[in-house]
């Protein structure tokens, strides 16, 4: 991770991808410590911020503008050398987002995947982006970059993620950049949560008063397990969103969540999953599917008594 004998290591916290108007801390690690350092921008634009100044431990940059985008290096203080400074560090690319219209991000075959599978994240736009970047929230490494393919007035790139492991689960966003400004990125796509299932034992799913009910009768689906899951997720076949509830410890030492579906109007096949607060995007095996049948007069859909979660937000904690 660190540089060579006389080469500092330059890093960015929280990320090298910085929204326009945001802040980022640049750290120059030299000889097992954070000492005084100088900072350079390779294209020599926007140099007034450095102006021969010496920084201590870290440099807080911001609020950033498109002019901040580019490649940076640092030199660590080396008092007894000829120049007083180390060799230049590794190059660090700072990308500034929010400069063009956001692209779209889709998952194929879908955002809910089994451990070991591969997912294709497709980033596309009607803006003719030369490059697309894919970034996972909370990661300080550089985003993945692909050249955009232009077809029928649409530019796109397919990022292959896999085989999926818990470390790859999370919230993804993609960005585009136009020619001649490779580090001035677009606004982020809407976030896309990639969820990995099949890591823990399956919960059980049951219906009260039962899986076959009269139209208009109130139905509650209960998801429970001996495992101390923090959150349960309930999905219905054919619906994009899932519902989630905090698990409640019961006297029989199980952990349970009760999903009220309201008055029964329409049947469907339901599954539930458990997850832990520390890894909100890593879910258990699916419960056995539960077919809820409604006798009487079914209408076109089941009203949602609780606000369904959006396609994103799964990977956030429930407060």
């Amino acid at each position: 991770l660190m540089g060579g004998q006389d080469k500092p290591f330059l890093s960015a916290r929280p990320s090298t991808v910085v929204p326009r108007g945001g802040h980022v801390a640049l750290q120059c690690h030299y000889r097992r410590g954070f000492n005084n350092f100088m900072l350079y921008k390779e294209d020599r634009s926007h140099v007034p911020i450095f102006h021969g100044r010496i920084f201590q431990e870290s440099f807080i940059m911001g609020p950033v503008t498109p002019a901040h985008a580019g490649t940076y290096r640092c030199r660590g203080s080396r008092p007894h050398s000829l120049t007083g400074w180390s060799a230049p560090s590794n190059p660090l690319v700072i990308m500034v987002t929010g400069n063009h219209r956001k692209p779209s991000l889709l998952a194929h075959p879908g955002p809910l995947l089994k451990s070991g599978e591969t997912v294709i994240l497709q980033c596309w736009s009607d803006v003719m982006f030369e490059h697309f970047f894919l970034h996972r929230e909370g990661i300080s490494e550089d985003p993945s970059r692909l050249v955009g393919q232009i077809h029928d007035g649409v530019s796109k790139a397919n990022f292959s993620i896999g085989p999926l492991m818990p470390v790859l689960a999370g919230t993804y966003r993609c960005y585009g950049s136009v020619p001649h400004s490779p580090y001035q990125l677009s606004a982020p796509s809407d976030p896309l949560d990639i969820v990995i299932t099949g890591l823990y034992e399956k919960p059980s799913l049951s219906a009260q008063p039962g899986p076959t009910v009269q139209a208009g009768e109130n139905v509650t689906l209960s998801c429970s397990s001996w495992s101390s899951y923090d959150i349960y997720h309930l999905s219905r076949e054919g619906e994009a969103h899932e519902r989630r509830l905090r698990a409640v410890p019961k006297v029989n030492r199980t952990f349970q969540a009760d999903f009220p579906l309201g008055p029964a109007t329409h049947g469907g096949t339901y599954r539930c999953f458990g997850s832990f607060r520390a890894l909100p995007c890593v879910w258990s095996n699916s419960s056995d599917p539960l077919l809820v049948s409604v006798t009487g007069n079914p209408s076109s859909s089941w009203p949602s008594p609780t606000e369904p979660s959006s396609k994103s937000g799964i990977c956030r904690h429930l407060h």
Partner: antibody, heavy 118, light 107 residues
């Protein structure tokens, strides 16, 4: 949204100390710094200095070295300004403002009035 | 220390007027100039930084320009809600220093 909330007004006697707090919310506290600015009717806005919330390293303007001290409680996303051995000329409104090494102060606290009088 | 001399210290304008405030630095500050607006009873608010970059949510009637030692804040069509004191600040070298302020009133 980004907010900086400062502690309330203070009335102090000369020679006493005062500690002004500035609680930040709406952003990751350690990715920016906290600047401190004094406003007096006579001198207008004057920069006291700033503290790097990532490294904890403070920097003071020459005129404010000695009796003025910055500190942080990163777990509470709070920055502090302590003024010791207060003098009548320290009577002012003190502002905290988010900012870094580039000196741009993009969000400000509401200000804390400190009055030093016997 | 770099001294920022702001002028005028007071101006009165009618709604819709174009208003210009200038700031002169005692040395070249290489476009590292910010402008703030302070309304009565409120803290200062960032309008512009790096001479011409508008801060998030700032109406586009506010613009900045300049280079070297001379900088300008322009309000293209002043509104009643723009009544405030405006300050320039150099963010080129520490200690960061502010201008004395320009009080803008509406006739």
């Amino acid at each position: 949204q980004i907010q900086l909330v400062q502690s309330g007004s203070e009335l102090k006697k000369p020679g006493a100390s005062v500690k002004v707090s500035c609680k930040a919310s709406g952003y990751t506290f350690t990715t920016a710094g906290m600047q401190w600015v004094q406003k007096t009717p006579g001198k207008g806005l004057e920069w006291i200095g700033w503290i790097n919330s990532h490294s904890g390293v403070p920097k003071y303007a020459e005129d404010f070295k000695g009796r003025f001290a910055f500190s942080l409680d990163t777990s509470a996303s709070t920055a502090y300004l302590q003024i010791s051995s207060l003098k009548a000329e320290d009577t002012a409104v003190y502002f905290c403002a988010r900012g870094g090494d580039e000196g741009v102060m993009d969000y400000w606290g509401q200000g804390t009035s400190v009055t030093v009088s016997s | 220390d770099i001294v920022m001399t702001q002028s005028p210290s007071f101006l009165s304008a009618s709604v819709g007027d174009r208003v210009t405030i200038t700031c002169k630095a005692s040395q070249d500050v290489s476009t590292a100039v910010a402008w703030y607006q302070q309304k009565p009873g409120q803290p200062p608010k960032l309008l512009i930084y790096w001479t011409s970059t508008r801060h998030t949510g700032v109406p586009d009637r506010f613009s900045g320009s300049g280079s070297g030692t001379d900088y300008t804040l322009t309000i293209s069509s002043v509104q009643a809600e723009d009544v405030a004191v405006y300050y320039c600040q150099q963010h080129y070298s520490t200690p960061w220093t502010f201008g004395g302020g320009t009080k803008v009133e509406i006739k």
